[in-house]
Interface confidence: low
Amino acid sequence: QEGKFSGPLKPMTFSIYEGQEPSQIIFQFKANPPAVTFELTGETDNIFVIEREGLLYYNRALDRETRSTHNLQVAALDANGIIVEGPVPITIKVKDINDNRPTFLQSKYEGSVRQNSRPGKPFLYVNATDLDDPATPNGQLYYQIVIQLPMINNVMYFQINNKTGAISLTREGSQELNPAKNPSYNLVISVKDMGGQSENSFSDTTSVDIIVTENIWKAPKPVEMVENSTDPHPIKITQVRWNDPGAQYSLVDKEKLPRFPFSIDQEGDIYVTQPLDREEKDAYVFYAVAKDEYGKPLSYPLEIHVKVKDINDNPPTCPSPVTVFEVQENERLGNSIGTLTAHDRDEENTANSFLNYRIVEQTPKLPMDGLFLIQTYAGMLQLAKQSLKKQDTPQYNLTIEVSDKDFKTLCFVQINVIDINDQIPIFEKSDYGNLTLAEDTNIGSTILTIQATDADEPFTGSSKILYHIIKGDSEGRLGVDTDPHTNTGYVIIKKPLDFETAAVSNIVFKAENPEPLVFGVKYNASSFAKFTLIVTDVNEAPQFSQHVFQAKVSEDVAIGTKVGNVTAKDPEGLDISYSLRGDTRGWLKIDHVTGEIFSVAPLDREAGSPYRVQVVATEVGGSSLSSVSEFHLILMDVNDNPPRLAKDYTGLFFCHPLSAPGSLIFEATDDDQHLFRGPHFTFSLGSGSLQNDWEVSKINGTHARLSTRHTEFEEREYVVLIRINDGGRPPLEGIVSLPVTFCSCVEGSCFRPAGHQTGIPTVGM
């Protein structure tokens, strides 16, 4: 900033603020003999003056909006007025001050928006201009909604992009706008310069009238369809309608069913195409889609719900061919023998599946019929008349009718009369001593065999023994399996042993029968046994808190941003060191101590998301054991890829001479993520000079048509530059070139004399 205040004649540039009365001289040029005086020419506008001695100054305020740069020339003259040096260019750049207010292009704007339009999607733009320099705050405009009328519950339904003036719906507006309640709104919009940040900014306002139009693209009410319909199919069940005619409708089956029994016609009527079976599938959810003529979705898909109504088309079924129960000889009247649970595939908790139970036959009828009764709705069998005697009748067979409101089914029950349970299980020893095991002993290992005996009738519920651990194993690390033939108990490891939490466990077993003991007999100390389990320490690897850690960040996060963290603990309490494995793209680093993961390079969703690396946790000291887990980094898209042509368009041609203006269609794409609606590109010619010969018109979000404006083209190749804007945040623009050849044609193909065969176009238009 410290420069020479005077010097020889040479090209120089100075910057001066506009609008301020002169307060400083600009420069003092020094003459080298034979030069004695100086002369100023160029865009002086009678403002810039050079004194004969070389003092350059200005005599009144500058105006950047009149001229932003003054290109001057200074020459040195000798005593005869002949130029002996120069002229050299002197550039005066006029720096902007905020001396112009922004102005809306219209004092009133009108627009319409459809209810339930996507929030944030612009439906109208307001536009203001400011003569000040747009590269400075003076010309940077900031749009704001001053008021929305009417304002319901203090909720804004509309929003404006502060920079672009794009008006769109808020989330609330998308959900709540309803033309039946309020068909029109008025917004007062302000624009300020200085980026809206200064008290000294200038402003302007405009009025926006907005009409809300009805959106008839709505999900219909859920449909109920009775199963096994005998009516002729297809049957119309509901309908959807796009807001304008001409939409192409289709259904999407998200569940990928082997049989999808629905269709839609081009009116938007939805049909069921065949009878449904509730027992196969009781509800369907699928989507109706509306597309334009180019197959692009017009809006979000609608969810269609179909519930299948039950009819009673299934009889009750028995749980097994024969259900076996046991009853002790001395059981009292009313005691429960067991419960018969039949099933019905019809809809639960309805009359179609509500079951009744009735005993229709008892064999033998000894000493009498009607020894048993069954609870009508619960299916529980009880002893009805007297205690049974095994020596008279060791077995009874019952036939039970199970019925719903339309169907009856017969089920068979066998009741075995068994000896009374008057003997308790007795352990062969009460203390099985100490057992020492390493904490890494395999799950499923048998670590101890225990044995109790029972003197009741063999192979009945009175003598069968079940072993339970009643003390010393609250974590459920151990279990006991019983051999049904020998009543031997095998103590097995069900969950990993752990020295750190349970080094010594005092285990107590209880031996029980599945059948109840007779009145007056109780389990005593003979039915209990104990043993002591001692667990020894094994150095174990660290344990991650999760098998897979997942994090989600935007692909444009700054280098050094924390993107996630992992945690592991060492069972022995040693410190842990974290490291990464498989970071093939070199995007990440991990804090060895905390497990925090940071970005160390630019991330790129288009290179692949999620990005998967392994995280390693290693003991510090000890045996340096380590464990591995996964870290998945989901990269959220930002708009960082400009549009481009979707394919190679070399070889486009028109037959010369053109008999009428022609056109061709091209497609654009980009590599960013597009939600259901796909890209929304806008197209324009890449330079103004092309506009006399060509025009470009948008067909839909991805396709455009390039048309000739006349027929007077030369027989040669033209390269047409197209500007494609993706309308993203921030908007990105690509300039692509379409080479179009005008050539003589033979039978619709380009004709080239021999020796001119290179680069022959192959597509005629």
């Epitope: 900033q1 205040f5 307060s23 400083q24 001289i25 420069f27």
Partner: nanobody, 118 residues
Framework: QVQLQESGGGLVQPGGSTRLSCVSS???????MGWFRQAPGKEREFVAL????????EYSDFVMGRFTVSRGNTQNSVNLQMNNLKPEDTGIYYC????????????WGQGTQVTVSS
């Protein structure tokens, strides 16, 4: 010999204010008066200046809105009112006579220390 004499400055609390003054031993036409500063370990940088007619003040971005440059009692004096001071404002403040739009320095003062610290 022409001299510039600065005064003011010293130790100031963050958020506080101080005023620097500078007097020249002679009056210059076409020459502007202003202030530069040098923080420890950094190059000398422009702070503010007042045009020789006193009708135009210029400021660097980092002091805009906090510092005000004004004419003293005479044509050959200039003041710098420093408000809302920050620790990064610490340094030696030099009065200077400059020439033209390029702010070419013709004459330096000997400097005065300003320390912003709690």
């Amino acid at each position: 010999q022409v001299q510039l004499q600065e005064s003011g400055g010293g130790l100031v609390q963050p958020g506080g204010s101080t005023r620097l003054s500078c007097v020249s031993s002679r009056t210059f036409s076409y020459y502007d008066m202003g202030w530069f500063r040098q923080a420890p370990g950094k190059e000398r940088e422009f702070v503010a200046l007042l045009s020789w007619r006193g009708n135009n003040a210029e400021y660097s971005d980092f002091v805009m809105g906090r510092f005000t440059v004004s004419r003293g009692n005479t044509q050959n004096s200039v003041n710098l009112q420093m408000n809302n001071l920050k620790p990064e404002d610490t340094g030696i403040y030099y009065c200077a006579v400059t020439y033209g739009v390029a702010r070419s320095v013709r004459l330096w003062g000997q400097g005065t220390q300003v320390t912003v610290s709690s």
